[in-house]
């Protein structure tokens, strides 16, 4: 399963789409910056087996997909870009699920790293709470878009490390 290679390409395409989605000048949103507490430590460990690592990345993509599939998201972003972005994420999720099934037969370790997945879930809960508190304002969404781009970039480093491990 060559997921790290295909996923890295998908990640790059998703990042490009995210970059194109901006609707307002980020300069007007500086005071809306927020610490979402990206769970960096969950993407630092070398202790993961491949299936576990993929399950953490899967959770991250799934949560991003959920976030950008809400009606509030649809009201904010340009529809065709949003659809392309969702399609890209969906393709990545399908690739990952197929890859995990392949890996399970190879590895003896548990399929999921529960603590890491929970940390990712909580991270996205903080993002959702922030959007709610900010009443889904354009600037709040702009801050979240920047955060998701950053988290994708950080997870890309994780994927590259995973590829080197193979």
């Amino acid at each position: 399963c060559d997921l790290p290679q295909t996923h890295s390409l998908g990640n790059r395409r998703a990042l490009i789409l995210l970059a194109q989605m901006g609707r307002i000048s980020p300069f007007s949103c500086l005071k809306d910056r927020h610490d979402f507490g990206f769970p960096q430590e969950e993407f630092d460990g070398n202790q993961f087996q491949k299936a576990q690592a993929i399950s953490v990345l899967h959770e991250m993509i799934q949560q991003t997909f959920n976030l950008f599939s809400t009606k509030d998201s649809s009201a904010t972003w340009e529809q065709s870009l949003l659809e392309k972005f969702s399609t890209e994420l969906n393709q990545q999720l399908n690739d990952m699920e197929a890859c995990v099934i392949q890996e399970v037969g190879v590895e003896e370790t548990p399929l999921m790293n529960v603590d890491s997945i929970l940390a990712v879930k909580k991270y996205f809960q903080r993002i959702t709470l922030y959007l709610t508190e900010k009443k889904y304002s354009p600037c709040a969404w702009e801050v979240v878009r920047a955060e998701i781009m950053r988290s994708f970039s950080l997870s890309k480093i994780f994927q590259e490390r995973l590829r080197r491990k193979e």
Epitope: A19, L30, K31, D32, H34, V143, A146, R150
Partner: antibody, heavy 121, light 107 residues
């Protein structure tokens, strides 16, 4: 290794034009904004303006609006600061520095080495 | 514009001293305050960001505190290499603004 490398010192006459540069390396250039800071001889730091290299959106300090132009060429990971007509009062050290944009990350964590601009007749 | 006022503008201290520099914003800036150190002929160096976060590679003798309008940079035990000028800077809103600087000199 993250680096911002600025162009060399310049000596110019009043009324001349000038464009100085700041080249970023070791990171994704379009993921960070680039700010420009002036330091006149023996004085403190003054923020001039900032650019988002991903789309060349800019924001200037009111004190520098109309006095300078900030631009960027993302294809060569370089930001620029330019003057169309220099004055003696533009004599200063100019620094570029990277800014994380809307991300909760350290502001101006890497700086260029500075470009000394001397304007004298 | 948000005005940043540092005090004192200069101070004399000895190696081993505890040094405190304050910075006051003309309006609330939450915790969007950074501290920089600058030595003669060198570019500024980030020490503290978001009021109290220590920048990677900066010695733990440097610490920052405060929120709203009043902020403090503390050097717990001054070292020879700490003699420099220190600047605060607000990153709450544009235009970004710096304090006028505090020069820390050898007594």
């Amino acid at each position: 290794e993250v680096q911002l490398v600025q162009s060399g010192a310049e000596v110019k006459k009043p009324g001349e034009s000038l464009k100085i540069s700041c080249k970023g390396s070791g990171y994704s250039f379009t993921s960070y904004w680039i700010g420009w800071v002036r330091q006149m001889p023996g004085k403190g730091l003054e923020w001039m303006g900032i650019i988002d290299p991903s789309d060349s959106d800019t924001r200037y300090s009111p004190s520098f609006q109309g006095q300078v132009t900030i631009s960027a060429d993302k294809s060569i990971s370089t930001a620029y600061l330019q003057w169309s007509s220099l004055k003696a009062s533009d004599t200063a050290m100019y620094y570029c520095a990277r800014h994380p944009g809307l991300n909760w990350a350290p502001d101006f964590d890497y700086w260029g080495q500075g470009t000394l601009v001397t304007v004298s007749s | 514009d948000i005005q940043m006022t540092q005090s004192p503008s200069s101070l004399s201290a000895s190696v081993g001293d505890r040094v405190t520099i304050t910075c006051r914003a003309s309006q609330s800036i939450d915790r969007a305050l950074n501290w920089y150190q600058q030595k003669p002929g060198k570019a500024p160096k980030l020490l503290i960001y978001f009021a109290s976060s220590l920048q990677s590679g900066v010695p733990s003798r440097f610490s920052g505190s405060g929120s709203g309008t009043d902020f403090t940079l503390t050097i717990s035990s001054l070292q020879p290499e700490d003699f420099a000028t220190y600047y605060c800077q607000q990153s709450f809103d544009f235009p970004l603004t710096f304090g006028q600087g505090t020069k820390v000199e050898i007594k």
